[in-house]
């Protein structure tokens, strides 16, 4: 579809005569008839196959024709066509004298013709005008012509239809050859596909408009290149969505179980060595001079009452020193210079001579001990605290400080390790002598049933149209990440199919 345009510029008829030679009275009131037709080697009369157009009276005898409207007619003259331009044509231009106002052919005398020109040739579609001048014995006509395409038609023959658009079906303008030229930010055959934010991850991100980056399920970040870990993941990371890969020292499905209590909490005091012994469990090995579960108690070396025979103990930096009472000597005042005659036995103890009176021995009443019955019985000496409990003298009584996992007056009762419900995911807990054991339900394993071993919901490849499948660990179901242009729980529905789609 296009338009053949003819621009009349100047007509010369100096003598004001008709083709017959007869003069016009009072002058030749001139109008034109134009016939455009298919190429003929010899232009002959017949149908104007490409169209006809007539002008009003444009002037008398000789005159120049103005560029736009002249006397109600249009210049250039328009001859539209609704077919592929063939590239060749024939053109007939007739100049006529109008004695009256009726310009219809049947209303004019046959000798009213002033002049007639006929040309033919090749003409390519283009913006440039071809200038021509035709001269007869009495007249001269100067004119130019061209062929241009109608709006929305393009190409060498005006045969390519292209209508610019900026809507759901495309975002483009048309090139001179009729090909689409996508607007900035759009791509694809019909410029329907937005160009996402630069760097937006090809699989994990998408966009519905240019320079956007929307994340598919399981991904986050400006460019959708960061996976979202499993919901509730505390001390873990992911490399694919919904994972929870535990950081060093953490365990469990949500990486919230502390496997390195020593590093994370430093419970051992006074330079003690800490050893991890299970989840939230540890053992402190104390340096000399310290005691307690966390080695928080400073040991006095005099606490063990090393001085005998009523000797008094003094703490020193590198140990202790015994101050012996009269009649005793030695590191622990263990040697005596006394005999029974000196009444060396205290607290009602009875004295017995030994080695012909050179030595003696005291027989002590209950609750007293020592070589001179000088010490009250230490209730801790018999090691009454079971299971590694620490005995503490508290005046007339004693007390056991129990290790984790034990209780009772003498630490004789084993605290149930199962009381804390350590088995995850409904595992059954069994108390053992040295700890506990979890029996895990189907789909879980690990010391505490913290490792999920369930069937991969993506194993059956449920996602269609090259969608990516992820397993949602919390529900054992799959999630399909649809590529651009597809929707549905399994990406089964194409959003749109081009008219040329092969049904």
């Amino acid at each position: 579809s296009g338009v053949f345009q003819l621009q009349l510029q100047e007509f010369i008829n100096e003598r004001g005569v008709l083709a017959s030679g007869r003069p016009c009275e009072p002058g030749c009131r001139t109008f034109f008839r134009v016939c455009l037709k298919h190429f003929q080697a010899v232009v002959s009369p017949g149908p104007c196959t490409f169209g006809t157009v007539s002008t009003p009276v444009l002037g008398t005898n000789s005159f120049a024709v103005r560029d736009d409207s002249s006397g109600g007619g249009r210049n250039p003259l328009q001859l539209p066509f609704n077919f592929t331009w063939p590239g060749t044509f024939s053109l007939i231009i007739e100049a006529w004298h109008a004695p009256g106002d009726d310009l219809r052919p049947e209303a004019l005398p046959p000798d009213a013709l002033i002049s007639k020109i006929a040309i033919q040739g090749s003409l390519a579609v283009g913006q440039n005008w071809l200038l021509d001048e035709q001269t007869s014995t009495l007249t001269r006509l100067r004119y130019s012509y061209r062929v241009i395409c109608s709006d929305n038609y393009y190409g060498d023959n005006c045969s390519r239809l292209c209508k610019k658009r900026n809507d759901h079906f495309g975002h483009y303008v048309c090139q001179p050859d009729g090909n689409l030229s996508c607007l900035p930010g759009w791509t694809g055959e019909y410029c329907q596909q937005p160009i996402c934010l630069s760097g937006c991850h090809e699989q994990n991100g998408y966009c519905s408009k240019p320079a956007e980056c929307l994340c598919r399920p399981g991904w986050q970040g400006r460019l959708c290149n960061e996976c979202i870990p499993h919901n509730g993941c505390r001390h873990g990371t992911c490399s694919t969505p919904w994972q929870c890969t535990c950081d060093e020292g953490w365990g469990g499905l949500f990486c919230d179980q502390d496997l390195n209590y020593c590093t994370h909490h430093s419970p051992c005091k006074n330079g003690a060595t800490c050893s991890n012994s299970g989840q939230r469990s540890y053992t402190c090995t104390c340096r000399p001079g310290y005691t307690g579960v966390d080695c928080e108690l400073e040991l006095s070396e005099c606490d063990s009452n090393p001085c005998r025979n009523g000797g008094s103990c003094k703490d020193q930096e590198d140990g202790y020193h015994c101050l012996c009472p009269p009649g005793y000597y030695g590191l622990h005042c263990e040697h005596s210079t006394l005999s029974c005659a000196d009444s060396p036995c205290f607290n009602g103890g009875s004295c017995r001579e030994r080695n012909q009176g050179a030595n003696y021995a005291c027989e002590c009443p209950p609750n007293f001990t020592g070589s001179n019955c000088e010490k009250k019985v230490d209730r801790c000496t018999s090691n009454p605290c079971a299971n590694g409990g620490q005995c503490l003298n508290r005046g007339p009584s004693r007390m056991c400080r129990c290790r984790p996992g034990f209780t009772g007056t003498y630490c004789e009762l084993h605290v149930s390790d199962c009381a804390r419900n350590p088995c995850a995911h409904g595992g059954t807990c069994h108390d053992l002598e040295n700890g506990l054991m979890c029996t895990c339900p189907a789909g879980f394993s690990g010391r505490r049933c913290e490792v999920r071993t369930s069937i991969d919901a993506c194993a059956s490849s449920p996602c269609f149209n090259r969608a990516t499948c992820y397993t949602d660990l919390s529900t054992d179901t799959f999630v399909c990440n649809c590529p651009y242009g597809f929707v549905g729980s399994r990406c089964e529905f194409p959003v749109g199919l081009p008219p040329s789609f092969p049904w």
């Epitope: 269609f464 149209n465 549905g488 729980s489 399994r490 089964e492 529905f493």
Partner: nanobody, 117 residues
């Protein structure tokens, strides 16, 4: 493969209503995902509404709030209730089914919907 037959198309005034129905053959109809597409002359075929395998529904932005898709597995039918119709809704409407294992789609022959203003 299921055979699909659409019905219910016709001429309706703008702002009027129409109900399209699609009858499917086959005893495993309930396992298929179903959808309605439409195609106007010279335009691409586009998704109007769909019921996914898990029962979730999907609608084109242009029909949200006006069209409702539903299925009756006992009668092997899927329907599209169209309210507040606009001239731009005029098109040939096609029923579409998706096989649950292969993902292959089947089309009906289509039913014409004309909306006069």
């Amino acid at each position: 493969e299921v055979q699909l037959v659409e019905s219910g198309g016709g001429l309706v005034q703008a702002e009027g209503s129409l109900r399209l129905s699609c009858a499917a053959s086959g005893s495993t109809f309930s396992t298929y995902a179903m959808a309605w597409y439409r195609q106007a002359p010279g335009k691409q075929r586009e998704l109007v509404a769909g019921i996914s395998f898990d029962g979730s529904t999907h609608y084109a932005e242009s029909v949200k709030g006006r069209f409702t898709i539903s299925r009756d597995d006992a009668k092997n039918t899927v329907s599209l209730q169209m309210n507040s119709l606009k001239p731009e809704d005029a098109a040939v409407y096609y029923c579409y089914s998706v096989h649950p294992s292969t993902g292959f789609g089947s089309w009906g022959q289509g039913t014409q919907v004309t909306v006069s203003s």
